[in-house]
Every structure is written in C-alpha cells, then in structure tokens.
C-alpha cells in the first residue's frame, strides 16, 4: 500500500512579514497529480481558500491584495490528487507590520562601539508592550524576541551585546506587540546605525559558545547574547 | 561578503539541455529567493524564474515547460536546466539574490549577481 | 501576468540635467518595485527597491517614487558615469518581470 501523499511546501511572496496595506501571495507547491489546493489559517473555519492548480498543476496561487489584521496569522495548505488529500505543509506565519506606533531604538552608551567592548541597543514603546523584536537589516531571519515572563507589560527591552566585533555592524530596528497576538507589530522604529571600530578582532564568534553575537554580515539569523536582560523579558530565538 | 559565480558549458548543440550552476561563497544559500536572469545579445533582461528554501519555485511562463531550478543545500550551490534550446536561448546568463527583509517594512530587490556567463546555442 | 512598461526607451541629456524614467505597471504591485542599472558589459547593479529606497553605496542623486502601478526613478544631475541602460522590475509575486529598459546617454 501506498504511503501517505508527500506535504506540499508552503511560502509566501515576498515574504512572511508585511507592511499594512500592501500585498501579499501565498503559494502551496505540491504535486504534478494535484487537482485542487486547500489553504487552512488557524483559529478560522477551514477551509481558508481553496485554489485550482496553476499549470502544471504543482501549485496554487493565494493572494491577497491588501494585508489587514485579519490576514496575520498561522497557515497551513494541503493539495488533493486522485487518491486523497495530502499531508498538511509546514506552517507559515504572516506577520503584519503597523498595527502600533513606533517605538524607539537607541544604543547604549552610544552607537560607536569599539571592537571588543559591549553595547546595549535599547528599544523603547511609549505604551506598554510585553514582546519587543529587533532585527538587523538585509537578514534572513530577521527577528530575535524579548517576551514578558507572565504577560508584564513592559515599556522597554535592553539587547545587550558583547564582546563586540565587525559582524555586529550595520543597521538595526525594532517592533513592540502585543502577547495577544504575535503575528501583529507596531511600525518600525528608525533605522539605527551601528558602528563598530578599533582592531581588537578574534575568530568570528560562533552561535554555539556561551556568549553569542548579532547577526552575520547578511544572512545570519541574529543570536542572543549571554546575559538576561535588566527589563525582565525572557529571551526567545524564533 | 556574499559572492555569487556562475558556471557552465558556453556552447550548448540546439534541441539538447542547458545546464548552469551558481555557487554561493561568503554566506548561506538558506532562506533567500536565489534566481536566474538572462540577456540575449543586445536584449534586455529576462527573469528565468526562482528556487526558495529547498525547492519552492517559479518560472516565467514563458520559459516554464522547459526550466527547472534545483539547490543543492550541501554544496551551497543552485542550478539551472533548460532542455531543448534553440538560438533564441543564445544569451549572457546571470545568477541572483533578492535580498532579505528591511525593517522598513520593505523586501529588497536583487541585491547580488553573478559576472554572468555567455551561452551560445549552436551546431 | 503583470506586464511593466518602460518610457522613453531612450534618452539623451546633458550633463548636470534632471532625468525622469517612468515605469507602469499593468495591475499595482503596492512598492515591491526595483531599479537596476547595468553599464555596457557589465553586471546589473541594485539602485532602488521599495520603489523608493536608495540601496546602499549609490548615490544621492538618485532617488525613485511611485506605488501601485506608477514609478518613476530621476536622476537629479545626471553625471557621465551614469550612462546606462535603467531597468524596472517587479517582484511582487512571481513572474518578476523586467520593464524593457531604458537607454540613458549623454549629449
């Protein structure tokens, strides 16, 4: 007997965090023998949409004109061939940018650090907030979270980074949400420029020893770094 | 600094398959829409079409019954086939990165190419 | 498919001339726009993405607008080194389509 229908691959165009207002596509990739594409979001009766296949039939095309907070969310699709539906896709999370208002992001002591030395980037919300996110520009996986322990609302969260050295260079911004739905984020803050100078270069660190660093020069996913910050947030790498 | 370098036959016969590959150095080829480009002679650019993660791709419809795009993670490098060429096919062809997410709410345009590389169809 | 025009698809200005190149899109692609500039034999290079932001390294004198289905790049004072072919691009959702380029020269 047959094993189960391989899991179409799901991603979204063009990409996963969007902007209020602008547009978005959602693709469910699955087989040549596909005769129908189902998308299911979670929390919404099922099915989400439902797609006929593109030609050649090995995907679906899910759009969505304006992004609004009813499209943030969790998604999963499936594809039906002759002999059944499939296994369910890896989910996508869609985020949505501002739905709050910005918050603030500054460095501590100042955005000129020597290599070697530590750095705090620090990012401020004028209304309570219990996630904060910072992300450094051009990344890949762009987003490293602070979250309240019990759903304090706090109105700041500390990034602490040390020891400094060249790949933490480059510019940065952060996001405040709320715990309620973490597929929601304020705007942007503005962009922080930091700037790391002096020689006092070792190896590259890697993400693995103790005290990990912020993101590699494009494409690395920022890490965390060793310390709990002072704000009482906890510390979570999604 | 992530570099891109484009590699391949520069005669291919007509009716047989073309094939490129483009080796990422300087960076991962994870998590970012990694394309092929190309140029005909005095032509202007074509988009090929796209491979993301391990295998979600897109074609321009024009080319899509003879494209296909594969990454192969372990060699950092993707690659291009497109079967039955003609002289049409005759072009520079480019690999390329669009590049990650801005926190400005924006996603970047294709950010790093390859030199290119020429193919020339012909017996 | 979404289809981009370009306009002019040539144009010849004088140094130190402010430049306009429009591109229109047959359906919006809300900011998922790009620029690129490639000089005879050589590799296109990234000026603009997000219809209006400066990619890092290309200068001032650059700068794009536009949303939905209008863009437009200008170059403020056109510089020789700026002879090129310009080329839009969407990437909105596949197929990213290339505008056809337009051919900027000096007088």
């Known amino acids: 007997q047959a094993g189960p229908l391989p899991k179409p691959t799901l991603w979204a165009e063009p990409g996963s965090v969007i902007s209020w207002g602008n547009s978005v596509t959602i693709w469910c990739q699955g087989t040549l023998e596909a005769r129908e594409y189902r998308l299911d979001k979670e929390e919404s009766p099922a099915p989400w949409d439902r797609q006929n296949p593109l030609e050649p039939k090995n995907k679906a095309r899910f759009s969505i004109p304006s992004m609004t907070e009813d499209y943030a969310g969790r998604y999963r699709c499936y594809y039906r061939s002759p002999v059944g539906w499939s296994q369910p896709s890896d989910p996508l999370e869609l985020v949505m940018t501002g739905a709050y208002s910005k918050p603030t992001l500054s460095a501590l002591p100042s955005p000129l650090v020597t290599s070697g030395k530590s750095v705090t980037l620090l990012c401020q919300s004028r209304s309570p907030m219990d996630t904060f996110l910072l992300i450094k520009e051009r990344a890949a996986h762009p987003l490293l979270h602070l979250r309240s322990e019990h759903g304090a609302q706090q109105h700041q969260a500390e990034f602490p980074m040390s020891p400094v050295t060249s790949v933490h260079g480059g510019t940065y911004r952060c996001f405040s949400s709320h715990g309620f739905s973490h597929y929601l984020l304020s705007h942007p803050s503005d962009p922080l420029e930091l700037i790391v100078s002096g020689s006092l270069e070792g190896p590259r660190p890697s993400p693995t020893r103790s005290v990990s660093t912020a993101a590699g020069p494009e494409d690395q996913p920022l890490m965390p770094t060793g310390s709990v910050p002072h704000s009482g947030l906890r510390r979570h790498w999604e | 600094q992530v570099q891109l370098q484009e590699a391949g036959p520069g005669l291919v016969n007509p009716s047989k398959t073309l094939s490129l590959t483009c080796t990422v150095s300087g960076g991962s080829i994870s998590s970012y829409f990694w394309s092929w480009i190309r140029q005909p002679p005095g032509k202007g650019l074509e988009w090929i079409g796209y491979i993301y993660n391990s295998g979600s791709t897109n074609y321009n419809p024009s080319l899509q019954s003879r494209v296909t795009i594969s990454v192969d993670m372990s060699k950092n490098h993707f690659s291009l086939k497109l079967s039955s060429v003609t002289a049409a096919d005759t072009a520079v062809y480019y690999c390329?990165?669009?590049?990650?997410?801005?926190?400005?709410?924006?996603?970047?345009?294709?950010?790093?190419w390859g030199q290119g590389t020429t193919v020339t169809v012909s017996s | 498919d979404i289809q981009m025009t370009q306009s002019p698809s040539s144009l010849s200005a004088s140094a130190g001339d402010r430049v306009t190149i429009t591109c229109r899109a047959s359906?919006?692609?809300?900011?998922?726009l790009a620029w690129y500039q490639q000089k005879p034999g050589k590799v296109p290079k990234l000026l603009m993405y997000?219809?209006?932001a400066l990619q890092s390294g290309v200068p001032s004198r650059f700068s794009g607008s536009g949303s939905g289905t209008d863009f437009t790049l200008t170059i403020s004072s056109l510089q020789p080194e700026d002879v090129a072919t310009y080329y839009c691009q969407k990437y909105d959702s596949a197929p990213w389509t290339f505008g056809q380029g337009t051919k900027v020269e000096i007088k």
């Open positions: 997000a219809a209006s």
């Open positions: 359906q919006g692609i809300s900011n998922y």
């Open positions: 390329a990165r669009r590049g990650g997410y801005y926190g400005s709410g924006n996603y970047g345009g294709m950010d790093v």
